[in-house]
Interface confidence: low
């Protein structure tokens, strides 16, 4: 999986009038990294991990860059003629990647009201657009606007490609290692519930990447979906993720239940603690 930096900018119009605010979210290697909103942009690192990657001297630079990009996108939205009444959004997603063989990829995508209408490969400068007439109209609109400023057309997108890769390399050199795989810590806890039932909860934390399977099994067989309750897979602020799954079981039958976890090709099972032992911790390697 390549290292990646992804910028997601959104600007809005209301009844044809472009709003002064914008929202930018930056993801580094798929992790929420920076967030910048409204016209008083604050490049807010998303957790301690992001703080560590950025270092304390880069905030002003990130804020300035993101604010400039937001203004550019607002100008682009103002030139879209298809402004109907109500709330509309223009979204620009810019992605650059560095692969393990050191090859690079960069692309840029425009969405209007959530619908993709224009893409560009920032290395080859090749534009693509969906076949729908609405998308084609929007795409021509935006491309014409971008071409109005010849200098911008010639330099802006090359700069976006170069800057994105430069920023990505800078982040990767920050000294905070973005590890490919971090195994989860799995905790199983129990809490007393009513009428002879207990609730058992299996928590996985500190893992990367985010893809994980966590479920309860009875006698080795997965419980049905509707008897389990899942938490979302959420960033924990350290560049890793956390999640949980819970179910209700009859007291005395704890030994029949196990939590099954699968992550990055490794899997393990974790029993329910019995008696007065409330937490069982196991960290597989």
């Amino acid at each position: 999986e390549p290292h990646s930096l992804r910028y997601n900018l959104t600007v809005l119009s209301w009844d044809g009038s472009v709003q002064s605010g914008f929202l930018t979210e930056v993801h580094l290697d798929g992790q929420p990294f920076l967030r910048c909103d409204r016209q008083k942009c604050r490049a807010k690192p998303q957790g301690q991990w992001a703080e560590d990657v950025l270092g304390n001297k880069t905030w002003d630079r990130e804020t300035r860059d993101l604010t400039g990009n937001g203004k550019d996108l607002r100008m682009t939205l103002a030139h879209i003629k298809d402004q109907k009444e109500g709330l509309h959004s223009l979204q620009e997603i810019r992605v650059c990647e560095i692969h393990e063989d050191n090859s690079t990829r960069s692309s840029q995508h425009f969405y209007y009201d959530g619908e993709l209408f224009l893409s560009q490969n920032l290395e080859t400068k090749e534009w693509t657009m969906p076949q729908s007439s609405r998308a084609q109209t929007l795409a021509m609109n935006v491309r014409n606007f971008l071409k109005e400023d010849a200098m911008k057309t010639k330099t802006h997108y090359h700069a976006m490609h170069a800057d994105c890769l430069q920023e990505l390399r800078r982040y990767l050199k920050s000294g905070v290692v973005l590890r490919r795989t971090v195994p989860p810590m799995v905790n199983v806890t129990r809490s007393e519930a009513s009428e002879g039932n207990i609730t058992v909860t299996c928590r996985a934390s500190g893992f990367y990447p985010w893809n994980i399977t966590l479920s309860w099994r009875q006698d080795g067989v997965s419980l049905s979906h509707d008897t389990q309750q899942w938490g979302d897979v959420l960033p924990d602020g350290n560049g890793t993720y956390q999640t949980w799954v819970a179910t209700r079981i009859c007291q005395g039958e704890e030994q029949r239940f196990t939590c099954y976890m699968e992550h990055s090709g490794n899997h393990s099972t974790h029993p329910v603690p019995s008696g007065k032992v409330l937490v069982l911790q196991s960290h597989w390697q």
């Epitope: 929202l23 409204r38 109500g86 959530g114 979302d232 959420l234």
Partner: antibody, heavy 117, light 107 residues
Amino acid sequence: QVQLVESGGDVVQPGRSLRLSCAASGFTFSNYNIHWVRQAPGKGLEWVAVIRYDGINKYYADSVKGRFIISRDNSKNTLYLQMNSLRAEDTAVYYCASGPPDAFNIWGQGTMVTVSS
Amino acid sequence: AIQLTQSPSSLSASVGDRVTITCRASQGISSALAWYQQKPGKVPKSLIYDASSLESGVPSRFSGSGSGTDFTLTISSLQPEDFATYYCQQFNSYPITFGQGTRLEIK
């Protein structure tokens, strides 16, 4: 036009569960963080929970953490609030709200939840 | 959680008066503050976002100022439709919090 419409409010007994829905129309629902805000009778506004536009991040007020679950179905333009282990102090009008990004300029009309034995 | 304290809790004023409501945050929130107006039985209405930016369609007699921990909502010349309850709200960090409200009544 831009609209949020809540439903699912009811009178329930303490300890029971209830699920609220919020249907969105007139804007690109999947682009927006959506929040639940509540207001107890005669009281002020209290923020309850938020779910990010893509459903990845969720945050809750301490008063509902562990009992309420916020979720969304972007394919249906609908927001949900699953309320478990309800208490008398959860009695309120529940609003869904949104805006670009966190100051709410889009509000639903509210749905009343009464928790009483 | 960041606490917001509004003052006064209630105030009486007359049409044409200049009115100021303050909101103090328990810690710095930059300019991440919004103001809302709510009339009895109605949905809250956004007036100001980012401490000083006027929402679209809101009359220019409403203005907001402040940064960090101290914020102000000012109504330059009260109109009959302005009598309502006003709330401040911080969106600097989760959990989002509201002030307790300021009730503005006719004198």
